[in-house]
């Protein structure tokens, strides 16, 4: 097993999470890349990169776009419109087979709550969006667990729609370390 | 071979202004995020502005944003920054690098740029 | 804006040696840190991105480790080639940042 560290993103309804997930070029630049759920101990692939990559050549399903960078070793993640229902954990995947994913980046527990997005909290717990407006508000705790790195059992992948990106970016803060255990 | 090479350089009034230039080979410049890093004399790294690779997205380091502009032309390979209202702040070897989504993969051998009366 | 800072400023090492390299950010950046070397009059040179992941061409005798918000840049045998500054780069906030530098010298 491999201990991987979890952050956890607090965010308001309508924002909009952005993860980048490295990767080695030299091993999986030409690797399809993916975004999954954990459903229970299930991971859902809920979008997935062509194949092979093509540096920027955005994937779009729904609320979810991928963008892969092969020459920088980067997989760009971003959700627009956060809802509650969202909340969850998160992990970035090089696909290599339906029933087998390697987990890239350590994953993300994402916490979406009702409320005003236009507006930032305190200054202690908030970060200025250096691109874009609105600017927006993330939390990022850091707990940890344990985790092997193959996920199997994959269930049925989403329909992937080539569209353009999001346009918000939200930036986090670490706060709080706790352990949590995630598979068994 | 991969190369940036940055021009432009010179020595310029404060208020002055001035257009750097990057000339790409050896790779895919069309498929790649550039930057513009800079060094001033004896110090560090400071990264001055990004666009994406089909110029829909530009983005600057606070200290230079409305006095400088990044763009590029893929057809020619070139990638430039207009710099306006210079200061003597500004004074540093500009560095042409590609990247800008993460990490700056390729550098050039950097340009000097010095703004003084 | 993310505040990387490294230590210490300078680091005196025999060829040989192990050397040890910290980097601290005043936020998680999670995994998105790279480490650069630049030696006097060149163009820095990617060392690692991702936090440990080695760019291409690097020798094995450098590794990075760390996460969120404290990370190392280790050169398990230091060669003549290998005394320069480096630093490390966060790209987890778009305002990219670098940390101000150590200067590796031969002691």
């Known amino acids: 097993t491999t201990e991987l560290t979890e952050e956890k993103y607090e965010y308001k309804e309508g924002q909009t999470l952005e993860v980048k997930c490295d990767y080695a070029l030299e091993k999986y630049a030409n690797s399809r890349k993916a975004w999954q759920k954990m459903e229970g101990k299930m991971p859902k692939i809920l979008a997935k990169t062509e194949r092979p990559s093509e540096n920027s050549h955005p994937v779009q399903v729904g609320r979810i776009t991928l963008e892969d960078y092969p020459d920088h070793g980067l997989l760009q993640v971003r959700m627009t419109n956060l809802q509650v229902e969202d909340s969850g954990l998160y992990q970035c995947v090089i696909y290599q087979h339906p029933k087998e994913s390697h987990v890239l980046f350590n994953p993300i527990c994402l916490v979406v709550t009702k409320g005003s997005s236009g507006t930032p909290g305190s200054s202690e717990n908030s970060t200025q969006n250096v691109y874009r407006t609105p600017s927006t508000t993330a939390k990022a705790l850091g707990p940890r667990y344990t985790s092997p790195r193959t996920v199997t059992q994959a269930p049925p992948e989403s329909t992937v729609v080539v569209s353009t990106p999001g346009s918000e970016i939200n930036l986090t803060n670490v706060t709080d370390i706790i352990r949590v255990p995630v598979f068994n | 071979e991969v190369q940036l090479v940055e021009s432009g350089g010179v020595l310029v009034q404060p208020g002055g202004s001035l257009r750097l230039s990057c000339a790409a080979s050896g790779i895919t410049f069309s498929n790649s995020w550039m930057s513009w890093v800079r060094q001033a004399p004896g110090k560090g790294l400071e990264w001055v502005a990004n666009i994406k690779q089909d110029g829909s997205e530009k983005y600057y380091v606070d200290s230079v944003k409305g006095r400088f502009t990044i763009s590029r032309d893929n057809a020619k390979e070139s990638l430039f920054l207009q710099m306006n209202s210079l200061r003597a702040e500004d004074t540093a070897v500009y560095y042409c690098?590609?990247?800008?989504?993460?990490?700056?993969?390729?550098w050039g051998q950097g340009t000097m740029v010095t703004v003084s009366s | 804006e993310i505040l990387m800072t490294q230590s210490p400023a300078t680091l005196s090492v025999s060829p040989g040696e192990r050397a040890t390299l910290s980097c601290r950010a005043s936020?998680?950046?999670?995994?998105?840190l790279a480490w650069y070397q630049q030696k006097p009059g060149q163009a820095p040179r990617l060392l690692i991105y991702?936090?440990?992941i080695r760019a291409t061409g690097i020798p094995a005798r450098f590794s990075g480790s760390g996460s969120r918000t404290e990370f190392t840049l280790t050169i398990s045998s230091l060669q003549s080639e290998d005394f320069a500054v480096y630093y490390c780069?966060?790209?987890?906030?778009?305002?990219?940042?670098f940390g101000q530098g150590t200067k590796l010298e031969i002691k």
């Open positions: 991702g936090a440990s």
């Open positions: 936020q998680s950046v999670s995994s998105n």
């Open positions: 690098a590609r990247g800008g989504i993460s990490t700056f993969d390729i």
């Open positions: 780069q966060q790209y987890k906030n778009w305002m990219y940042t």
